[in-house]
Interface confidence: low
Amino acid sequence: EICGPGIDIRNDYQQLKRLENCTVIEGYLHILLISKAEDYRSYRFPKLTVITEYLLLFRVAGLESLGDLFPNLTVIRGWKLFYNYALVIFEMTNLKDIGLYNLRNITRGAIRIEKNADLCYLSTVDWSLILDAVSNNYIVGNKPPKECGDLCPGTMEEKPMCEKTTINNEYNYRCWTTNRCQKMCPSTCGKRACTENNECCHPECLGSCSAPDNDTACVACRHYYYAGVCVPACPPNTYRFEGWRCVDRDFCANILSAESSDSEGFVIHDGECMQECPSGFIRNGSQSMYCIPCEGPCPKVCEEEKKTKTIDSVTSAQMLQGCTIFKGNLLINIRRGNNIASELENFMGLIEVVTGYVKIRHSHALVSLSFLKNLRLILGEEQLEGNYSFYVLDNQNLQQLWDWDHRNLTIKAGKMYFAFNPKLCVSEIYRMEEVTGTKGRQSKGDINTRNNGERASCESDVLHFTSTTTSKNRIIITWHRYRPPDYRDLISFTVYYKEAPFKNVTEYDGQDACGSNSWNMVDVDLPPNKDVEPGILLHGLKPWTQYAVYVKAVTLTMVENDHIRGAKSEILYIRTNASVPSIPLDVLSASNSSSQLIVKWNPPSLPNGNLSYYIVRWQRQPQDGYLYRHNYCSKDKIPIRKYADGTIDIEEVTENPKTEVCGGEKGPCCACPKTEAEKQAEKEEAEYRKVFENFLHNSIFVPRPE
């Protein structure tokens, strides 16, 4: 029986009975938060062979091995992962070994085995036989290997039964428990699975099979399962489903997701039966099972029951995520907040149409309205008293409405009102009148020319750049000397710069009045020598990266209407030079014949330019005789077992420090102080652990159902 769409077993160990008839779990399996130690020996689920998503074990008291529970679990597909992991074993206080002796393949994702105080037999498993890449595995804070004394079957009787492989230059026997070897297929099978008798399975099999070279005898399928056969692709009129099987249209039409309402079933798109149309696509009609591309962002209509939606925090904005049409009125009242501009853009940036009015008042945290970056139509079907459909009052730091060079906004009905916005230039408001088609609708008092823009540099002159020079991590720029009518009114220049992969940034991107700003800022004084142009050296930049740069003159000059006169440049885009790339990642090599090596790697994390080729060098190494001399059975004295506490400590040094030549004299050496890089790595590691643990807790601790 196929079970799913995800099984969560918690609190009561008897819930395990739900797994009784499962051969495949289509989804995830959680076993967690069973605080009372139980006897699990009577629970055994030999039918379970495949989990299509991930397996998560967390705080299950009394469980000592998974081998008895899931003796035939062969494949974890990792179609969906838990924080990048397909197997998570976390804080399992009594687990002594993993014991999944039939686990042959984790198709996608890594493993995370952490804080299991009594867990051994970790170094005896060769995960590279199960996973494609082991570099992302995280196995930390378990019982120290020295205290485990892991012995594979037959080792003590000098009749070792298991095969050997090399991990981290250590050639050793591979097993899951004291009596279960890790199964390996003959090299003649290559990437194929094999039977218990080491006969090669059909290429479409994954994990194992009951008969050789037979696509109907697979335990699991490499690609897709259909009508008892493993197939490389789904046959005509069938569709991929949950990453592992083929289903027909009727089946897809009859599925109902946990998230969607009953009226909205699954869809068929690009040969797959899926819960929702993918990003950029929309259903071809409300009852349709098919997707068509959206023109622009996909439409999503949101409605406010109370007609007016107040946005006074990031939380209230969150409700509008993904909305493109808002039926109702928007009242924006953001007095404070952290990183507010980018948060608001994240949640409100797709809104294109507001059917009622938009009112922005007391929003002292806003510098710009550019977070409504797709707003193109205010219908004004409902208006404020006085027939206003766009109302902007008392926003102490509002400097920009939108970038009118790249913005079309229409206000279909109603007037605009602006008052007490001291940093908003009247010219900006007049520009909005022209763009939105409201010119002539406003009466004299609707746009107050004295209290809008009274504290802003409104009449801006243009600063021109005169030269730019780049290296791999530096940019030098200079610009014309700017002389306001009274040179004493020039305080300084401010240079703004930031990474800009695309030439589409504006001055107000990511900027709010609470200190958040996506731009880096540097102050530059005017050189006293009149012949020298002001300039700056920007250093510590990334190689082969495009930056956006602009300069503002900070002045005190007043012009007519007591408005401040200022100057600023256009935004300049400039790319640093290329540099040497960082090292290629995840280098793996394996031999597939007596005269060939296959080497695989991933691109460097920092290409620092356009990569055009790789250089591969190799050299012959002498055979290491040590591998043959060392007797792995004669364990050096195994230390007295100390119960590990499951925390992650630096291993204690039990031997005397080695005597080496240090600083020209013989004597015991102290450990070298950690380098900055090592300290940073440790800090990042601790941070990463914390992030994962938070993710785990947030994912699994849920309120009890009412």
């Epitope: 029986e1 079970c3 008839n21 009508a227 008892g228 069938t238 027909d248 009727d250």
Partner: antibody, heavy 123, light 112 residues
């Protein structure tokens, strides 16, 4: 359009087992449970049991555990129900009907029905 | 076994009237996954049953919106807002939450 074809009528002697067939077409046979439902003249519907064509997993109403045996032939996409030792009590219309694999949040209902086979037990 | 009791056994109505059929289960029919698999079927003379409502209140595709289902726990109702001639036949409720699955005894909708 998915269809289930059943023979119209079967006459059977008391005590002589009979095997009713239900041939599926125009859908993936192994993706749905096959259910059998009984309707006696002048009475209501009664669920007999179901079988999963992919692995022949069966669930029967205990009242029918000795009376009905459910089997499938994957290759011909046909489900069978054998009525053992029939008596006059077994004279009824027997319907086969499919339902979606039953788990999670899947919709669960009989969406396609056969026309029914009228079984008459008579000597 | 879950016993499903339908009332009334027979329901005479005039065309255009509202009809209401009740179905009561002997125990709660909430499945362990949280869903209530309660369905309504209509069987017309000489035909196979046809699905009307699934999971208490969801209309199957092609079923007119004059049919509606409601209820929870152990009490469920099928309503037909304006009865038409094509609605006549025997209505069955059915629970698919607990094996063995069981039908109600049926309600015959007929013309007054």
């Amino acid at each position: 359009q998915a269809q289930l074809q059943q023979p119209g009528a079967v006459l059977v002697r008391p005590g002589a087992s009979v095997k009713l067939s239900c041939k599926a077409s125009s859908y993936s046979f192994t993706d749905y449970w096959m259910n059998w439902v009984k309707r006696r003249p002048g009475q209501g519907l009664q669920w007999i049991g179901l079988i999963h064509p992919s692995d022949s997993e069966t669930r029967l109403d205990q009242n029918f555990k000795d009376k009905a045996t459910l089997t499938v032939d994957k290759f011909s996409s046909t489900a069978y129900m054998q009525l053992n030792s029939p008596t006059s009590e077994d004279s009824a219309v027997y319907y086969c009907t499919r339902s979606v694999i039953y788990y999670g949040n899947y919709r669960w209902y009989f969406d396609v029905w056969g026309a029914g086979t009228t079984v008459t037990v008579s000597s | 076994d879950v016993l499903m009791t339908q009332t009334p056994l027979s329901l005479p109505v005039s065309l255009g009237d509202q009809a209401s059929i009740s179905c009561r289960s002997s125990q709660t029919i909430i499945h362990s996954n949280g869903n209530t698999y309660l369905e309504w079927y209509l069987q017309k003379p000489g035909q196979s049953p046809k699905l009307l409502i699934y999971k208490v209140s969801n209309r199957f595709s092609g079923v007119p919106d004059r049919f509606s289902g409601s209820g929870s726990g152990t009490d469920f109702t099928l309503k037909i807002s304006r009865v038409e001639a094509e609605d006549l036949g025997v209505y069955y409720c059915f629970q698919g939450s607990h094996v063995p699955y069981t039908f109600g005894g049926g309600t015959k909708l007929e013309i007054k």
